[in-house]
Amino acid sequence: LIIGFGISGRHSITVTTVASAGNIGEDGILSCTFEPDIKLSDIVIQWLKEGVLGLVHEFKEGKDELSEQDEMFRGRTAVFADQVIVGNASLRLKNVQLTDAGTYKCYIITSKGKGNANLEYKTGAFSMPEVNVDYNASSETLRCEAPRWFPQPTVVWASQVDQGANFSEVSNTSFELNSENVTMKVVSVLYNVTINNTYSCMIENDIAKATGDIKVTESEIKRRSHLQLLNSKAS
């Protein structure tokens, strides 16, 4: 879609962002791409956050310009300077905080025109679960542990053999606050486990969904884990 701006004589350019989630305490990426320009000096990138007075980050004339940067982002943001020329305006965010959640705008000016796109950034904590056989227990028991989650997730057990079965009566889940007083360790125990079966421990909050599988046979134990971020959509 090309829109003419009579006053500036510039057209709109396509800017694309992807909604994403940040894992608190780790680094995050706010993704943004645009129609590239031939000259780096003609490209201006501005990252703004709704409700924040100063800029999140500004890059222009081939370098960072951070005199108007908001204090909450000082020393925590960087663009991939060598990739700006090919249309990458993504922002790296150091040590993601809960307060970094919100609506961001990636605003681009090039010699071809202007454009912007919003990005919803969620923050929380999510980690891969590990399922093990609990040999200390009196009966056959599985223990599912994940070190860091926030907000508090739900934990659901499932099994390949008893598909659709409700394991809430034979499982017990606890949440233990970690030392930084935000994230929590998730521990879920499943009792009365039968051999030659595959069990899944599914942990989910509004940011991520993670599954830890364990296959228990008489001769071996096989484990598998995967994690999926929810609501990653382009705009």
Epitope: G25, E26, K63, D64, L66, D70, E71, G75, K94, N95
Partner: antibody, heavy 119, light 107 residues
Framework: QIQLQESGPGLVQPSQSLSITCTVS????????VQWVRQSPGKGLEWLGV???????DYNAAFISRLSISKDNSKSQVFFKMNSLQADDTAIYYC?????????????WGQGTLVTVSA | NIVMTQSPKSMSMSVGERVTLSCKAS??????VSWYQQKPEQSPKLLIY???NRYTGVPDRFTGSGSATDFTLTISSVQAEDLADYHC?????????FGSGTKLEIK
């Protein structure tokens, strides 16, 4: 190329204040923060504070009551002032710049200025 | 404050030997660890940033590795000019802190 150069008094009387100027070239103070680090004789490095592109500062809590950092973007100068110096503040004082706008490593250092606190 | 503990305090190596320096953080610092070389009467020089990225112009015999709390600087084949103090530092959270250094001597 990127350069930082400290200029200081060399000798400071106990209980007096220390002022150091760091003059930079090859980059703009509106793009990068400038860090301050000191090294006492035979000791390790100690981070003192930073002034960011926008002029805001962060200080090591151990020095917050007697340290102030300011700058003049147009002159490419950063000003470091520490009050109430004692003998154990004798050190080489460095200004330094980060490798990127995210603090990942101090890539550029001044030559350092030796400050001796003595009567 | 995050404490960075370096070991050993000092070591003496022959030219051509492999050197491994250790730096342990008292809390997780992600990959926000840098390594510096400081020769007598000189300012520190950045060798490694982001735990494993070699800074421009640094010889490829210097390698950094590690994440979270345990970090290593390896010199694959030490040279006479590597005689220096080596410092690790974290820039994950305030106050930024450094280890007390490892003195590398050449036999």
């Amino acid at each position: 190329q990127i350069q930082l150069q400290e200029s200081g008094p060399g000798l400071v009387q106990p209980s007096q204040s220390l002022s150091i100027t760091c003059t930079v070239s090859g980059f703009s103070l509106t793009s990068y923060g400038v860090q301050w680090v000191r090294q006492s004789p035979g000791k390790g490095l100690e981070w003192l504070g930073v002034i960011w592109s926008g002029g805001s500062t962060d200080y090591n809590a151990a020095f917050i009551s007697r340290l102030s950092i300011s700058k003049d973007n147009s002159k490419s100068q950063v000003f470091f002032k520490m009050n109430s110096l004692q003998a154990d503040d004798t050190a080489i004082y460095y200004c330094a710049r980060d490798i990127t706008t995210i603090v990942e490593g101090f890539a550029h250092w001044g030559q350092g200025t030796l400050v001796t606190v003595s009567a | 404050n995050i404490v960075m503990t370096q070991s050993p305090k000092s070591m003496s190596m022959s030219v051509g030997e492999r050197v491994t320096l250790s730096c342990k953080a008292s809390e997780k610092v992600g990959t926000y660890v840098s390594w510096y070389q400081q020769k007598p009467e000189q300012s520190p020089k950045l060798l490694i940033y982001g735990a494993s990225n070699r800074y421009t112009g640094v010889p490829d015999r210097f390698t950094g590795s590690g994440s979270a709390t345990d970090f290593t600087l390896t010199i694959s084949s030490v040279q006479a000019e590597d005689l220096a103090d080596y410092h690790c530092g974290q820039s994950y959270s305030y106050p930024f802190t450094f280890g007390s250094g490892t003195k590398l001597e050449i036999k």
